[in-house]
Every structure is written in structure tokens, then in C-alpha cells.
Amino acid sequence: IWELKKDVYVVELDWYPDAPGEMVVLTCDTPEEDGITWTLDQSSEVLGSGKTLTIQVKEFGDAGQYTCHKGGEVLSHSLLLLHKKEDGIWSTDILKDQKEPKNKTFLRCEAKNYSGRFTCWWLTTISTDLTFSVKSSRGSSDPQGVTCGAATLSAERVRGDNKEYEYSVECQEDSACPAAEESLPIEVMVDAVHKLKYENYTSSFFIRDIIKPDPPKNLQLKPLKNSRQVEVSWEYPDTWSTPHSYFSLTFCVQVQGKSKREKKDRVFTDKTSATVICRKNASISVRAQDRYYSSSWSEWASVPCS
Amino acid sequence: RNLPVATPDPGMFPCLHHSQNLLRAVSNMLQKARQTLEFYPCTSEEIDHEDITKDKTSTVEACLPLELTKNESCLNSRETSFITNGSCLASRKTSFMMALCLSSIYEDLKMYQVEFKTMNAKLLMDPKRQIFLDQNMLAVIDELMQALNFNSETVPQKSSLEEPDFYKTKIKLCILLHAFRIRAVTIDRVMSYLNAS
């Protein structure tokens, strides 16, 4: 058993049929010695008396808010949560496996630049009685500070018969140098509590590996005289690290017809303009990627080809 | 320490070209190592990230763009002095700071070159003959060093009398390649910045 936060404790259980469970001793936080009784949740049934209560925690029925009283007055609470371990593996029931970029990916993180700010998100089908707490650091043995905000519900989607909820959190490394060469990864730890179930999820990454620039901005077309060619121009996104001559991007320009089956014309360039051929009903799209370190491409910025 | 915004410098172009070749070569070599050594811990997640130039050179600090010198997190108190001549400079007006930056890059390349050559000698003794360093990568390191053209004492190649542990050597190769790729990215960024300045 360990303390998650004040008056909230996590009991780690090996979860299998007829498992013996864990013996837990609760102590009432009071100077009083006599006349103390214990109850669980809203029940008035007295579970025991005395300053300490010893319980055998085997299942969720044994978890919950234990309260010690004296003469009708509440003295203190202890909330017990369960953390299940099945076949030596901690349960991951609360969050959905996003399977990207690999299986058992519960947390996904992205950074728009090298400033040390990043966003992580996760998915769940659970809509109520759910809380998250996020901590982060650079490295684990001698951790350096990363400050994370509160996790918030950022999107709701309908997937078949289920609703899916996306939560996200923003974090900022306390003293980040955009030009630094990372040797210690960022660690992100998410504590998830659903009703009386506790789970924790972690992710470890270098900012350089989770870079995904915003799409290029101010995408414009200039038709060339007596030609169905156009000069496409764009600018670096505002959120990208500066100076741009140091943090350079490379770009992919795509001409895509109306139907997905149509051949796509693609041009790769380090410049912020390109000449492409417009096709009927086509759109021109441009996306960006760090020129020197191949992390993710940005989403496409698009304009109709007319 | 920072790179001042200097006048356009025609001597920078060869260095930019060589640094781009360097990044391509080390990225290809790392990819080859990951594929060939698929049963060894050779991915970014599996290896320890070591920097053989740590406390010997200070390329990131010495080559910091002017715009980032206002960022206190980027300023490191380490002081390093370097030799200040080099053909990528091409102009007498080129500042001491830029010379410091380029000579730091040169020292990085020299250190990695020695490590890679030593390692290749060991890998050539491996009866499995599983992996060797790409000669193209070694040649590209050499070309960039020549373009930088700093006078420096040659570092003797390390020789070892004991029987090499090939497993450890291959893991060390992965560690070195990952670190060198990161440094090659920094070098490319620096050359691009100097070229645009």
C-alpha cells in the first residue's frame, strides 16, 4: 500500500481467483484513543472499533472511503483504491490502446517546435467518475523540472455504438533550450482513477522525436500566363522555432484530383514556393517536416486548384 | 557565445554541402545498423545516449544562433578555446565566435573519426562479419574536415591488445551512430544558419 495523495491510498493486488489479497492497517488521524468506530462509504454498519482497523483487501467491495467516527463526529477519512496486477502485468482498463505508433500506446505526445512545450493526449470510453493527474520530468534518476497543467476533456467522438473521450494535457519543460541536443528523455506519468480503480500510464520520449510542425501558413496560388501551371507559395507556421535558417523545414507539395484514385503529383522542396500543374478539380496541398531530423509531417494546408 | 549575423560568405557553401552529405550518410548507416543488428538493442529507446564529445567540445553553445543567446537555458558556463583558422571562414572579418564554432565542429568530427576507425578495425575481426562501417560515411567525415581545414594534432588511433567483445562493440556502434546523427543534425543546422547569415 502507498499514499497517492493526502488520505488516498493505493492497494496493489495480485488479481486472480481466490487470491489472498492484502492485509491493510488503517489508522485514525486523531489524538483520541477510545470510543472510535469505523464505517465504509455511506453504510452505517460498524466494521470495527479502536484507533486502527485491520482489513483484508481482496476485491473492489473492500475498497472505498473508510471513515473513523467518535460520538457521531467524523474524525478522518482514508480512501482505498485498488491497482490490479494480472499475470504480473498492471491493468490498463481505463485507457484505450491507440496502437500508434505501436501496440500498447496509451499516451501520445506531440510538440509543435523545440521550445520544450508539448501536448499529450489519451482516449477512454469512460464518461463519469474519472480523474487524471499528470506529472513529468526530464530524466528519471536526477529529474529536471517539467510543469504540466490539468488534464482536460478535449474531444468527444462516436465510434460505432461507443462514445470515445479524448483528454489532453499541456506541459512545458522549465528550462529548455531549443538548440540543445537531448540525451535524457522526457518522462510523462499519468495517474488515472475510475471509481475505485487506480492505474498508471507512462511515456518516455525525446522532444525531437515527437515534433510535428503546424501546417504551412498563407498558402497562395499565382497562375502562370497561358499555362495551367501555378506558382504555389507559403510561409513557415508561426509556431515553428526560430531562427528559421537554423530550424529549417522541408516541404511536400501535392496536387490531388477529386477522386482518391487519381494519380497524385508530389514535389519535395526546401524553398517556400514551387511550380506545379493544376489538374481539373484538383487541390494543392503543402505540408512541412523538420529538414534535418525526420519526425512527423505536419497536417496538410490546402487550396483549390483554380 | 553565439554566431553573429555575418556578411554572406561564399566559403560557407562547400561546408553546407558537405554537412548535408554527412547527415545523409550517418542516417543511412544508422538505418543499416538497426536493420542488420535487429536482435541487438539498437533503437533510440533501447540504447544509452552517450556523447563522446561531452566536456571536450561545446558545439551547441559555441554555435548558438544569435537569436537564442537571449535564452538563458541555452547559455552554458563552459569555456573552451579553439584554434581560429579555417577555409570555411573565407573572410578575415569572420568573428572569433564563428571560428570557435567551426573549430568545435572540426574537433567533434576528429573524435568521431577516431572512434569509428577503431571500431571498424574491431568489426573487421568479427568472424560473423555482420556489419562494417560504411566507407562513404568515413569519406564524408574526411571531406567535411578538409573543408573546415583546421590545423590540429592528429589523434592516434586507439589500439587494443585484448580480444574484442563483438557484442559490446556492436552495441557501442549503435550508441555512437545515434549520438553522431544528433550531432550531424546540429552541424547541418549551424551550416544552414551561417549560409543564410
Epitope: 497561358n226 495551367r228 501551371q229 489538374r279 | -
Partner: antibody, heavy 119, light 110 residues
Framework: QSLEESGGRLVTPGTPLTLTCTVS????????MNWVRQSPGKGLEWIGA?????GTAYANWAKGRFTISKTSTTVDLQIASPTTEDTATYFC????????????????WGPGTLVTVSS | AVLTQTPSPVSATVGGTVTIKCQSS????????LSWYQQKPGQPPKLLIY???TLASGVPSRFSGSGSGTQFTLTISGVQCDDAATYYC???????????FGGGTEVVVV
């Protein structure tokens, strides 16, 4: 910039025929080329086109009856099995724009070549 | 697509104005992929107007084009004897296979 059609002659029905349009002064890799025909005393009929990238398109009535192909300086129109209805002057015409859409304006035109199908 | 040209033939007097209409059974690509041609006997057609209203190089300014979508007009103001010819419209569409000429309008100058 000039175009000239050749290969027009008298043929018997069912005898395959290939017409050739020879171009000069521009590149077929940047222009779309069209074939148009005109039966005696009648209007213009668009047959089909081959675009700068080698893609072809045909009028719905012409599909399966005609095939358009090109080399670096010529554009061919193959008539698989001519009938008397195919008697006409055949013109080749270039798309006016560089990298023109199919259906863009046609300019310049060749002088035409006459095909007579008769038994 | 079917392009219907009206009227045909049309008679004009020197110095007068002639209007030829071209109606498309479907909307041309981007509302303006329509061109006009002049053809004289024994000659290939000659481009007059493209993109519905843009005058081709070397074409006298008495020729003008207008319209959008499915309805287009070629106007010859200040008709000259040399304008006696047959005029065709050509439409381009979303589907390339729908590309077609109108039936033609013969202009007789008296």
C-alpha cells in the same frame, strides 16, 4: 509552332488506319493534343485527346473505336475498324495552354487530312 | 454534353451586330471552360475566344464573348465582310469525356 496531319487515304470498311500528327516548335511533354474530325458539310466533332503526361480521354461515342498514342514528336490516331460514317477530314489541334486541361481551348490547328471509307 | 447553338444560319449586314448563343446541357468546368472558333471553307478552325470571354491574340476587338455556367454568347459588333464563316463553341467539363463542340452557326454577311 506547327502541326501537320498525314496518313489520310481511301480505305475499305474494316481496314485499320493510323493517322499521324507531326509537331514542331514545341514539346509534347508539356502540351495536350486533340483529334477533331469534320464530315463533309457537317460540324466539328471532338474525338479525343492525349495529355502532356500521356493520359488519354475519348468522347463517349469514340471509346473503343479510336486509340490515341504519342512519341516525342508525333501523335497517332488509330481507327480500329473504319466504317463509311468515319469519312471526314481529321484535324489535330494543340491545347492552347501549357499543361492544358482536356477541353481547354485548341490552338494551333493542323490543316487536316482527308479519310474516305468506301467499298 | 450537348452544346446547342442558335440561330443557324444568321444573316448580318456590314457594320451591324451579330449575337450567337451557345447553350450547354450541363455546367462547363469552373463555369468558364468554353471557347469559340471561326472556320472558313477549306481551312482549319481558328481560336477567337477562350475561358468564355478572353480574346485570343491577334483577334479583332469587335469579337467578344460572355456568359457563365450553361449559357454563353459570342457577339460580333461592326460586322465586316471577312466575318462570313461558321462559328463553333467548344465546352470542357468535369468529366473529360463530355468535351464537345456545338453544332455550328453559319454567319452570312449581306
Amino acid at each position: 509552332q506547327s502541326l501537320e496531319e498525314s496518313g489520310g487515304r481511301l480505305v475499305t470498311p474494316g481496314t485499320p488506319l493510323t493517322l499521324t500528327c507531326t509537331v514542331s516548335g514545341f514539346s509534347l511533354s508539356t502540351y495536350t493534343m486533340n483529334w477533331v474530325r469534320q464530315s463533309p458539310g457537317k460540324g466539328l466533332e471532338w474525338i479525343g485527346a492525349i495529355s502532356y503526361d500521356g493520359g488519354t480521354a475519348y468522347a463517349n461515342w469514340a471509346k473503343g473505336r479510336f486509340t490515341i498514342s504519342k512519341t516525342s514528336t508525333t501523335v497517332d490516331l488509330q481507327i480500329a475498324s473504319p466504317t463509311t460514317e468515319d469519312t471526314a477530314t481529321y484535324f489535330c489541334a494543340r491545347g492552347f495552354y501549357v499543361y492544358a486541361y482536356i477541353g481547354d481551348a485548341f490552338d494551333p490547328w493542323g490543316p487536316g487530312t482527308l479519310v474516305t471509307v468506301s467499298s | 454534353a450537348v452544346l446547342t447553338q442558335t440561330p443557324s444560319p444568321v444573316s448580318a449586314t456590314v457594320g451591324g451586330t451579330v449575337t450567337i448563343k451557345c447553350q450547354s446541357s450541363q455546367t462547363v468546368y469552373k463555369n468558364n471552360l468554353l471557347s469559340w472558333y471561326q472556320q472558313k471553307p477549306g481551312q482549319p478552325p481558328k481560336l477567337l475566344i477562350y475561358l468564355a470571354s478572353t480574346l485570343a491574340s491577334g483577334v479583332p476587338s469587335r469579337f467578344s464573348g460572355s456568359g457563365s455556367g450553361t449559357q454563353f454568347t459570342l457577339t460580333i459588333s461592326g460586322v465586316q465582310c471577312d466575318d462570313a464563316a461558321t462559328y463553333y463553341c467548344l465546352g470542357g467539363y468535369d468529366d473529360d469525356a463530355d468535351t464537345a463542340f456545338g453544332g455550328g452557326t453559319e454567319v452570312v454577311v449581306v
